[in-house]
């Protein structure tokens, strides 16, 4: 049975298909696979109709293959059983287990640190531009423009807390009203979900792993986008968030309190502060319209400084002009008086790498962006590999059952809500929804957490980050307390509203279905994942922002026809799906349109053509690098530089996506040998597929 029975066998025209959304490879053992699956008409269903890329319903398409690619893989234990080991073997196994655990923690630490550095890199590259987005107050009164500003700024600074703090400062200094700030907060919520989507891209090596990881990451995006689509018009019409938060603030007399404990930062800061430290006030100053801040560097040079309220000496025409007689003297020529001036005296320089480099922010940003992405990718591969070697057999079964099993009937419905609480709690502990969702992404990829379980965890993460913001607001000074608290509460109630919309009733869990659909498309056409990221997080917001600059009439003039077209496509797709008989024959499928308008295949051919040219050039380099890697790792069966093969061969491989077989010698003793004796059999290495397929984009 399909995950959504209401969609099963609902193809309006099963005769018309193009290639399936996924290759036949599945992690389900072969014996469980049916040779072929037929639909009610007896027609073999081995391929799926590809719907137009602009239709949201393309993402809800049922996967008609014999095996459901969303089924969690069985992680077979290839090692010797514990009972069959001698003392030496058992000792070695324990040491290896401990070693793996330490390595896992180490890579996880590096992973989190690289996320922090990635955020700093984004701020160095786009922080000033992001600040300038905020400085155009007239545009921000337009809710749609506010929304996209929130998205763009958060994407550029890779931190919703940074954009939130800018909004708070602007509201506190009356540069922005709470009403205008709400759409920006909604946008910030969307922008923060890009991090785990980037992390998911790192798992593009293996199609099924990527399918799950990308869907797991984008479930967050879809939740945020869908919530905004419903709640932004609702807020614009009723101002319910503004009214509700005002009511909460007036009902409960909030006092200043303690900020949330920075548990994760305490651990990561010592390391990340050695790499880069930023002066985030610069972005804030730009946002507040301080033109002088435009020339300041975001890179923090001085870490220790004392702020002296110094009495500055100024000359006055006579003693009558002195501040007071007690602040009046003469140096023999002029009469002087005292004025209080706050001066910052730098004492000690910061200890990060770039402190003595006089490189521009952009250069440092690009360096850090490259390095952090490489480290992020490397850590991810190693985490996946380590988890793959650890989570086998009994351990895997226990963990998967614990994470993915529901409570017994009649309390099954409570499981999701518990997951929401767990997500919120974990995010509260690590103080970052990006870190939590990004750490969860590889686990979804390797099949430890199902999408259905990842969804409430992600929703919880959204709540967790807002509770952190509420505590941060409570710890803010008196003059900003009310505005920061109201904005934090708006953020909180926005997420609560989103959960109420897209979680309680299983039928409304649209983000899961959309994410799975996107996962299917991205697994087949991996470039589409990059396209999705660029289109939804950069192109669309920038276009809307550009149109907003042109004014309301232009925005409406361009936006309304596009929205109407999307609605038309959506309605038509719905009718094709539910009751095709009421439609004219021509409209029962999309074949009346040119192929490029309803299939990704022509686009894929164009992209393949473009990448092939590039691949040919770097072919030799790729092959040499790959061979060296294989030699170092001791890999006996290594697919090097597939860019050098014939096109036909490449196509064939694309369909099959053969797993890499690596001998025991390939595996590091502390990695996936899983305590087995030297030379025992071959272990299927989960993550080497990621290495073998680095040219997917």
């Amino acid at each position: 049975m399909a995950p959504w029975p209401e969609l099963e066998n609902a193809q309006p025209n099963p005769g018309k298909f193009i290639e399936g959304a996924s290759g036949p490879q599945s992690s389900i053992p072969a014996k469980d696979k049916e040779a072929s699956k037929t639909n009610d008409n007896g027609t073999p269903v081995a391929k799926t109709e590809l719907l137009p890329s602009y239709s949201a319903l393309v993402l809800i398409e049922e996967h008609p293959e014999g095996t459901d690619p969303w089924d969690l893989p069985e992680l077979q234990d290839t090692g010797i059983k514990w009972s069959e080991r001698d003392t030496k073997g058992k000792t070695l196994c324990i040491f290896q287990g401990v070693g793996k655990f330490i390595l896992l923690l180490g890579f996880l630490y590096l992973f989190v640190c690289s996320l922090d550095v990635l955020s700093s890199a984004f701020q160095l590259v786009g922080g000033k531009v992001a600040g300038q987005f905020f400085s155009n107050n007239s545009i921000m009164s337009n809710p749609v423009a506010g929304l996209v500003i929130g998205v763009l700024v958060t994407v550029m600074v890779q931190s919703s807390s940074t954009s939130s703090s800018i909004i708070v400062s602007m509201v506190a200094s009356s540069l922005l009203t709470v009403r205008a700030a709400i759409p920006i907060i909604m946008g910030a919520n969307i922008g923060t979900s890009i991090t785990n989507t980037i992390v998911a891209l790192m798992q593009a090596g293996d199609r099924n792993e990527f399918r799950r990881a990308f869907a797991g990451a984008t479930v967050h995006d879809f939740f945020n986008w869908l919530s905004v689509f419903v709640l932004l018009p609702l807020e614009a019409a009723t101002h319910y968030l503004e009214i509700l938060t005002n009511l909460v603030l007036e009902t409960f007399k909030f006092q200043n309190g303690e900020d949330a404990p920075d548990i994760l930062k305490v651990i990561t800061d010592p390391f990340t502060k050695l790499i880069i430290q930023l002066d985030k006030k610069v972005i804030q100053q730009i946002a507040m319209g301080d033109s002088a801040a435009q020339n300041k560097s975001l890179i923090k040079i001085w870490c220790k400084s004392i702020t002296n309220v110094t009495e500055m000496n100024v000359t006055v025409p006579s003693t009558d002009n002195c501040t007071s007689p007690s602040y009046c003297w003469t140096d023999g020529i002029q009469t002087w008086t005292i004025q209080n001036v706050t001066q910052k005296e730098n004492i000690a320089k910061c200890q990060h790498i770039f402190v003595n480099f006089s490189l521009p922010d952009l250069a440092v940003g690009i360096i850090l962006l490259t390095v952090s992405l490489v480290v992020l990718c490397g850590c991810l591969i190693m985490i996946v590999k380590l988890l793959g070697s650890v989570l086998r057999g009994q351990v895997a079964t226990v963990i998967k059952k614990t994470l993915n099993t529901d409570f017994p009937f009649p309390f099954a419905w409570l499981t999701g809500y518990l997951a929401i609480l767990v997500g919120a709690g974990m995010t509260f502990i690590v103080q970052s929804s990006s870190v939590f969702t990004s750490a969860m992404t590889p686990l979804i990829g390797i099949g430890v957490i199902s999408i259905e379980r990842a969804y409430p965890l992600t929703l919880g993460s959204n709540i967790g980050t807002t509770t952190t913001a509420i505590l941060a607001a409570l710890a803010s000074p008196g003059n900003t307390l009310r505005s920061s608290l109201q904005i934090a509460l708006c953020h909180f109630f926005f997420n609560i509203s989103g959960i109420l919309l897209w979680y309680p009733i299983p039928f409304t869990r649209l983000p899961i279905r959309l994410a799975k659909g996107l996962g299917n498309i991205s697994a087949k056409y991996r470039w589409f994942a990059v396209f999705y990221l660029i289109f939804f997080f950069f192109v669309t917001p920038l276009t809307v922002f550009g149109l907003s600059l042109a004014g309301w009439p232009v925005l409406v003039g361009v936006g309304v026809p596009i929205i109407l077209l999307l609605l038309l496509v959506l309605c038509l797709r719905m009718l094709q799906f539910r009751c095709p008989r009421i439609l004219p024959l021509k409209l029962r499928d999309w074949n009346f349109l040119p192929l490029w308008m309803h299939s990704l295949k022509p686009w894929d051919n164009v992209i393949s053509l473009a990448t092939t040219c590039f691949q040919r050039r770097c072919c030799c380099c790729c092959r040499v690098c790959c061979r060296v890697c294989c030699m170092v790792c001791g890999c006996k069966c290594c697919r090097c530089s597939k860019c050098c093969r014939d096109q036909g061969e490449e196509e064939e491989e694309k369909e099959q996506d053969i797993p890499v077989k690596a001998s025991g010698a390939f595996d590091n003793a502390a990695m996936s040998k899983e305590c087995q004796d030297e030379g025992k059999g071959q272990v299927e290495v989960l993550s080497m597929k990621a290495l073998s397929n680095t040219t997917v984009f």
């Epitope: 000359t315 007689p325 003297w329 003469t330 023999g332």
Partner: antibody
Framework: QVQLVQSGAEVKKPGASVKVSCKAS????????VHWVRQAPGQGLEWMGA????????SYAQKFQGRVTMTRDTSTSTVYMELSSLRSEDTAVYYC????????????WGQGTLVTVSS | DVQMTQSPSSLSASVGDRVTITCRAS??????LNWYQQKPGKAVKLLIY???RLQSGVPSRFSGSGSGTDYTLTISSLQPEDFATYYC?????????FGQGTKLEIK
């Protein structure tokens, strides 16, 4: 080191004028004010006025207004004090002293120039 | 002009003694007061500025205090090189005015 070297002793007749020089070294001449203070035999110190070598600003004590003229030569880092219409009570040791702009104290003093007014 | 009166005019003390010299202004000078030391044949030296701030290079046995119109210079333990004439000077109101001086002699 900071030095203020004054010209030698002078003997003048009543009604005459005297011009005492003060050559500065060891510091940025234009960043400080140069003050003139005199001390009559067996008496206390008496402030006469000051000049700012940087911009040429001047200030004289009311008592000496019209009789005293202070000038500066930035090329030689020298300040001059000319006192006209000398009287016997003008017999004193004349000191030049350095005072930082904005400060009401003089931290370095010259060795003094004795001006004797007698007929 | 503000009149500055020092007392005593002269003072005899022994090495190791604690000595206090007083300076009274004819009006409130709001702590804008300095102390100088003058030795025969030597340049005048600034000891304390703004009532109580010790000029660099001046021994810590010298200290100043006071407010309003009354100010004091204290030498906690008299040393042989401290025998000299001491002057107070106000700079609150133009022109600068000095006290008549206090001569400190060896007993």
């Amino acid at each position: 080191q900071v030095q203020l070297v004054q010209s030698g002793a002078e003997v003048k007749k009543p009604g005459a004028s005297v011009k005492v020089s003060c050559k500065a070294s060891g510091f940025t001449f234009t960043s400080y004010n140069v003050h003139w203070v005199r001390q009559a035999p067996g008496q206390g110190l008496e402030w006469m006025g000051a000049i700012s070598p940087g911009n040429g600003d001047l200030s004289y004590a009311q008592k000496f207004q019209g009789r005293v003229t202070m000038t500066r030569d930035t090329s030689t880092s020298t300040v001059y004090m000319e006192l006209s219409s000398l009287r016997s009570e003008d017999t004193a040791v004349y000191y030049c002293a350095r005072g930082r702009t904005g400060m009401g104290a003089v931290d370095y003093w010259g060795q003094g120039t004795l001006v004797t007014v007698s007929s | 002009d503000v009149q500055m009166t020092q007392s005593p005019s002269s003072l005899s003390a022994s090495v190791g003694d604690r000595v206090t010299i007083t300076c009274r202004a004819s009006q409130d000078v709001y702590s804008y007061l300095n102390w100088y030391q003058q030795k025969p044949g030597k340049a005048v030296k600034l000891l304390i500025y703004y009532t109580s701030r010790l000029q660099s290079g001046v021994p810590s046995r010298f200290s100043g205090s006071g407010s309003g119109t009354d100010y004091t210079l204290t030498i906690s333990s008299l040393q042989p090189e401290d025998f000299a004439t001491y002057y107070c000077q106000q700079y609150n109101i133009f022109p600068w005015t000095f006290g008549q001086g206090t001569k400190l002699e060896i007993k």
